[in-house]
Structure formats: C-alpha cells, structure tokens
C-alpha cells in the first residue's frame, strides 16, 4: 500500500520527466532561488505545448524505459500480508454518496489538471483544497444541499438493499451481529471516507493514464 517502502516507485510520464529536467536546469541556474510553484508549472506547461514531437521524443523514451522498469519491478514485488485481501464489494450495492467537497472537486479537477498538466495528484488535491477553503460558507451551500440529497437517497437505497438481503459472499464480510448499532454506523462513516478517497485516487490515476496516452 501507500506505506510500503519496498513497493516499486510509480512510473513517470514523459511530461513528468520534462518537468523534472526543467527543475534541475532551474536549480543549476538559480541554486539559491526559491521556486514559485504555480508560476514554474505554468512556464513548463507552456514550453511543453510549443515543443516539437522530435524534442518530446527524448522524454517519451525516458517514460517508456521507466514503464518497463516499473513493470519489471512489479513482477517480483510481493505486497505485505493482508494488503491483497480486499473487502468483498457487491457491485449491486448502492454507491456511497459523495461529500460536498468531493462534489466540488469533481467540478473543478478537470480545469486544474487541464491548466497545469504537470501537477501531481497531491498538488491537484492541494489546489482544490485551497479553492474550497477560499469559498465562503454561503457558497458551499449548493454543494452541501446536493450532498445531503444524495446521502438521503443513499440511505433509502441501502435500507431497501439490506431488506432484500445481501448475497452470501458478501455476508461473510458482514460485521458480527452482536456489535452495537452505533459502532456499526461509525465504521460505515469511516468506510464512506475511505471509499471516497479511494475513488478519487482511482479517478486521478485513470485521468493520468489518459494524459499519458495523448
């Protein structure tokens, strides 16, 4: 998982190699200067857009080599115990509702990624967090209202789904009946957050792969 130091380093895109090179060049020229990140990434992205296919070729070769390295290392990588055991998820179960912040992120992530193609997943998330914090409480209301509506719908759907009875495979993973209702609800809330983060990561990874293909 995220904490395993033995896990192979993720593969880098051609653009990521280009940005890395830009950073190194900048450090050599201005060793003591502090980097204005948004300004720097903007300049990088502008430079990348004007580069010819031939100029980009060098970075594409580096990305191909890194992809091969990643695939090679992943073949021999053994994840820590318990990591491969994913909770059974019934594909027919109602999808957990997004939070207000998650809805906000879904709206503006494409713009952030489009304007700053070199930003890492973490930096995109950071920027979205700043935008959300910049938004007045009043202006968060439309997102909160929508999230509340979706939560309400989810609660109705999950009640109906549970009433129908879960498939046997799923029942094996169900929390033991003697656990108090409160404890169960707390766990579900935690799962909500985990799932949201997981979904967001998956979405970003998919988008990153799409970017690489272009």
């Amino acid at each position: 998982g995220k904490g395993d130091p033995k896990k192979p380093r993720g593969k880098m895109s051609s653009y990521a190699f280009f940005v890395q090179t830009c950073r190194e060049e900048h450090k050599k020229k201005h060793p003591d200067a502090s980097v204005n990140f948004s300004e720097f990434s903007k300049k990088c992205s502008e430079r990348w857009k004007t580069m010819s296919a031939k100029e980009k070729g060098k970075f594409e070769d580096m990305a191909k080599a890194d992809k091969a390295r990643y695939e090679r290392e992943m073949k021999t990588y053994i994840p820590p115990k318990g990591e491969t055991k994913k909770k059974f998820k019934d594909p027919n179960a109602p999808k957990r509702p997004p939070s207000a912040f998650f809805l906000f992120c879904s709206e503006y992530r494409p713009k952030i990624k489009g304007e700053h193609p070199g930003l890492s997943i973490g930096d995109v998330a950071k920027k979205l967090g700043e935008m959300w914090n910049n938004t007045a409480a009043d202006d968060k209301q439309p997102y909160e209202k929508k999230a509340a509506k979706l939560k309400e719908k989810y609660e109705k759907d999950i009640a109906a789904y549970r009433a129908k009875g879960k498939p046997d495979a799923a029942k094996k993973g169900v929390v033991k009946a003697e656990k108090s209702k409160k404890k169960k609800e707390e766990e579900e809330d935690e799962e909500d957050e985990e799932d949201e983060e997981e979904e967001e990561d998956e979405e970003d990874e998919e988008e990153e792969e799409d970017d690489d293909d272009e």
Partner: antibody, heavy 119, light 108 residues
Framework: EVQLLESGGGLVQPGGSLRLSCAAS???????DMWWVRQAPGKGLEWVS?????????AYADSVKGRFTISRDNSKNTLYLQMNSLRAEDTATYYC????????????WGQGTLVTVSS | DIQMTQSPGTLSLSPGERATLSCRAT???????LAWYQQKPGQAPRLLIY???SRATGIPDRFSGSGSGTDFTLTISRLEPEDFAVYYC?????????FGQGTRLEIK
C-alpha cells in the same frame, strides 16, 4: 479568442416564455462556471443565475426563482436560460458571462440579447 | 445582503486629468473579493480590476484599484478619450454577487 454569443431575445407578453442561448467558443467550456446577468434599460447590473461546469448545481436570484431555469450542454458549448411566467420587470438586456468557480469576477461577457415583456 | 454604493453618481472631467471613483460596502468584503468593470453605451461590461487591485489581462496600467474592507477606489491616472463610460464595482466574496449602481464618467 474567447467569444460568447447570446440569442433568443425578443418581445413577449406578460406570462409568456422565452429561451435564451449563449454559444461559447475559444475556450474549454466544460471547465467553467457560467452566469446570466441582466441590465434593465438605463439601470445597473443584476445577477440572474449561475451553473457549475457539469450543470449539476445551479443557483438563482430571488427575483427569478421558480420561474427561470439555467442549463448547459457541454457537447454543444452552449448555455441556456429558460424563462417562464415573464413579467414586465424582467425586461432587460441579458448577458451570459464566464466565471471561475463560485462567485467570481466575470472575465468574459457576451454582447447581450434584449428581452422585452410587454402587452 | 451586502449593499454596494458608488460615488459620485456622475464625474465630469477632461482628458489628461486623474479620475478617482469610490465604492463603499455596507459590510466588509470577504478577502477583498472586489472587481471593477467598464461599460460603454451599447456594449457589454469589461473586467478591469479583480481582487481589489489586480489588473485583468490587456488592461492599460493607467487603471489601478486599491482599498480593503469596506472602502475601495478605482483610479485612472490620465484620462484618455476612450475612458469615458460607466464604471461598476462588484463584490464576489459572498452570495449573492452584488454590483454597485455605477458611476458615469463624462467629458467636461
């Protein structure tokens, strides 16, 4: 070059309906919040409605709530304003404008389309 | 809701002079999220200044914005013939977005 072009204005009787369109070009329409702002003849500017990039969240000024509906079609790069139960006080030039996220300054505006509500 | 009051209602000046337009809010504008627009007859408004003092793309440097909290100013250092128009301030720190009633800048 960013361009916003409104259409659909005209003369309509009180209680009537009208649908305004705003065709966008020169930018990635699906990234931006869009707004409708109106200006009554010889008067100031008043925001009418707002919509997020996906179209899933909208907001309206109290004066038009329940009568106007904002929508967008990102595949056609077009913003719409469905205006029902029109009143004389809705007479104005309607502008579509591009925003950033949430309440924001409007960096680009259309040329406007005039809506006249009169019997 | 915040109310925005612009003064003066009309300002009569000659080309080459300095213009100072004022915009006052009934409560503090959050994070100084205030913009200024210029509107000429028969045209759409054009963004001049945002975040109280940042010039929008392509706006000449004779236009400058200042102020914070409840009091904001648009200054045009040397008036050009094309600057005579109506100017609006707008707060966008909170919903609803509110515009001032405008200041008409006319040739003396």
């Amino acid at each position: 070059e960013v361009q916003l072009l409104e259409s659909g204005g005209g003369l309509v009787q009180p209680g009537g309906s009208l649908r305004l369109s705003c065709a966008a070009s020169g930018f990635t329409f699906s990234w931006y919040d869009m707004w409708w702002v109106r200006q009554a003849p010889g008067k100031g500017l008043e925001w009418v409605s707002w919509i997020v990039p996906s179209g899933g969240i909208t907001a309206y000024a109290d004066s038009v709530k329940g009568r106007f509906t904002i929508s967008r079609d990102n595949s056609k790069n077009t913003l719409y304003l469905q205006m029902n139960s029109l009143r004389a006080e809705d007479t104005a030039t309607y502008y579509c404008a591009r925003g950033n996220y949430g309440p924001s300054p409007f960096d680009y505006w259309g040329q406007g389309t005039l809506v006249t509500v009169s019997s | 809701d915040i109310q925005m009051t612009q003064s003066p209602g009309t300002l009569s000046l000659s080309p080459g002079e300095r213009a100072t337009l004022s915009c006052r809010a009934t409560q503090s504008v959050r994070k100084n999220f205030l913009a200024w627009y210029q509107q000429k007859p028969g045209q759409a408004p054009r963004l001049l200044i945002y975040d109280a003092s940042s010039r929008a793309t392509g706006i000449p440097d004779r236009f400058s914005g200042s102020g914070s909290g409840t009091d904001f100013t648009l200054t045009i250092s040397r008036l050009e013939p094309e600057d005579f128009a109506v100017y609006y301030c707008q707060q966008y720190g909170n919903s609803p977005i509110i515009f001032g009633q405008g200041t008409r800048l006319e040739i003396k």
